[in-house]
């Protein structure tokens, strides 16, 4: 439950987050699980701990192993584990399955490929994108913030896409790459003003404090391929990326599904270790296309319990 898989390539930066959450004031100690040796916090070290984050700058194959993080409150120590695997760079263009992040889908006029794990890094735009190891060139490809947009997607755009960016740490630059598959759904159709399927407007969702919860923002935009169709979450009217609460993350990719022939997009807001303050936030599901913007609001409330003794 408190273990997380992470992977990277040798000579690249890798940053891993402790799977245990706590107050930002809590101290987090990191250890090599096998030797119980403490990981230093001094940034001059190649591998060092920085609060909830463990940084490999750069990573080496020998770094592979299980790392223990201990979140220390004044009264308790909570333990988590990061299972890290560092692979040798492949001599050829082939990216093995074990290096692939989750697959994303697109369609003729709606394609976004998000760069996985990028939120953990200190990077600056633009990203570099490659398909099957070839640098993407041409006006059809637009690197926008942390994702790639492909105009007029065709079936042969399917393949493995790699994002490459530079992580900056105290003036030193480190390369990071991440690869995921992209599949194309080829359909003709039409577009409509967005229809949000979930959540219902002004819905309230009961949650357990201390548990994880997911909020799905799902909207349909017409039939077949869509030129522009996006859904996203906002917190109190702010973008998730501006909110700077690591427990609350919008999933990197936007899944495209076709419900009764309709083109529907959804994105999941993942809230780890739900806290009291999360109940005070307003969660807005935004659906946007060329016809306009629609917004549905959902709030969280505490689940009521019957205690048995």
């Amino acid at each position: 439950k408190f273990s997380k898989q992470s992977w990277g390539l040798e000579n690249e930066a890798l940053i891993v987050r402790c799977p245990r959450q706590g107050k930002s004031s809590y101290i987090v100690d990191w250890y090599y699980s096998q030797t119980n040796k403490s990981i230093p916090t001094q940034e001059r070290n190649r591998v060092f701990a920085s609060g909830q984050l463990l940084k490999f700058l750069p990573a080496e194959v020998a770094d592979s192993g299980i790392y223990t993080c201990i979140v220390r409150s004044p009264t308790f120590n909570r333990t988590g584990y990061a299972n890290v695997t560092i692979y040798k760079k492949q001599p050829d263009c082939n990216v093995p399955d074990y290096l692939m992040y989750s697959t994303v889908s697109g369609s003729e006029k709606n394609s976004k490929i998000y760069c996985p794990t990028i939120d953990l890094y200190n990077w600056t735009a633009p990203l570099e994108w490659f398909k099957n190891c070839q640098a993407l060139q041409g006006s059809r490809y637009k690197a926008h913030k942390s994702f790639l947009v492909i105009d007029n997607v065709m079936t042969d755009d399917a393949g493995d896409y790699t994002c490459k960016f530079i992580h900056n740490e105290n003036g030193a630059n480190y390369s990071v790459t991440a690869t995921r598959s992209f599949t194309v759904k080829d359909e003709q159709g039409f577009s409509l003003f967005p229809v949000i399927r979930a959540p219902a407007h002004n819905e309230t969702k009961e949650v357990e404090i201390g548990e994880n919860t997911n909020l799905t923002c799902s909207a349909c935009f017409g039939k077949g391929a869509q030129f522009l169709a996006t859904v996203q979450w906002q917190l109190n009217g702010n973008k998730i990326t501006d909110f700077s609460e690591p427990r609350i993350q919008q999933e990197e990719g936007q899944n495209q599904s076709f419900s009764n022939g309709l083109a529907c997009v959804n994105t999941v807001l993942r809230i780890a270790d739900v806290k009291e303050e999360d109940l005070l936030l307003r969660y807005d599901c935004l659906a946007l296309n060329l016809h306009g913007l629609r917004r549905h609001t959902i709030r969280l409330s505490r689940k009521h319990h019957h205690h048995h003794h």
Epitope: K23, P74, T75, F76, E208, G210
Partner: antibody, heavy 117, light 106 residues
């Protein structure tokens, strides 16, 4: 050594309100959570609720919802538990305890509240 | 709702005995369970948290085991000071104490 010192015993009439204090020493109350637990005579422990004193967020067990209010004064490192609409079955020892979200580590000595007409 | 069944409710044993107390939940709560000891007129004392982590200063004769839905507190060799009431506490879903187990001298 962390110490939690609670206010003294109280005798209240049914329908009244009681407010118990819990003063923390050798510990900054903002750094963790404060829980309150009820124990009726000869009975087991019952968790009532908790507060994050740093931001004032509270959460209560359903049994006590609507009657209990937990507060904290970070300037004096003191937590408070107020229980209203008292009835005879609220006669119990009430404990404050500090801990994280999930458990209690250090406990106060307990405050006996007797509800009697 | 998470329901907890602690057993036995009372137990008679002798100094030197090995004693086990069980808590069973109606749903998988991983290791988010804790064990407390309470003596008459005193506040509870935390012995073990997150299933099997011994609180500093607690004698090693106390141990916790189990995961999922079945959890056990074991006292390997009872000492005179161990006669008390023991409670499990789950914190996977808010906080709920077990009913308690009163450990008495035989």
């Amino acid at each position: 050594e962390v110490q939690l010192v609670q206010s003294g015993a109280e005798v209240k009439k049914p329908g009244a309100t009681v407010k118990i204090s819990c003063k923390v020493s050798a510990f900054n109350i903002k750094d963790d959570y404060m829980h309150w637990v009820q124990q009726a005579p000869g009975k087991g422990l019952e968790w009532m609720g908790r507060i994050d004193p740093a931001i004032g967020n509270t959460e209560y067990a359903e049994k006590f919802q609507g009657r209990v209010t937990i507060t904290a004064d970070t300037s004096t490192d003191t937590a408070y538990m107020e229980l209203s609409s008292l009835r005879s079955e609220d006669t119990a020892v009430y404990y404050c305890a500090t801990g994280d979200f999930y458990a209690m580590a250090y406990w106060g000595q307990g405050t006996l509240v007797t509800v009697s007409s | 709702d998470i329901q907890m069944t602690q057993s036995p409710s009372s137990l008679s044993a002798s100094v030197g005995d090995r004693v086990t107390i069980t808590c069973i939940t109606n749903t998988d709560i991983d290791d988010v369970i804790h064990w407390y000891q309470q003596k008459p007129g005193k506040a509870p004392k935390l012995l073990i948290y997150e299933g099997n982590t011994l609180r500093p200063g607690v004698p090693s004769r106390f141990s916790g085991s189990g995961s999922g839905t079945d959890f056990t507190l074991t006292i390997s060799s009872l000492q005179p000071e161990d006669f008390a009431t023991y409670y499990c506490l789950q914190s996977d879903n808010l906080l709920t104490f077990g009913q308690g187990t009163k450990l008495e001298i035989k």
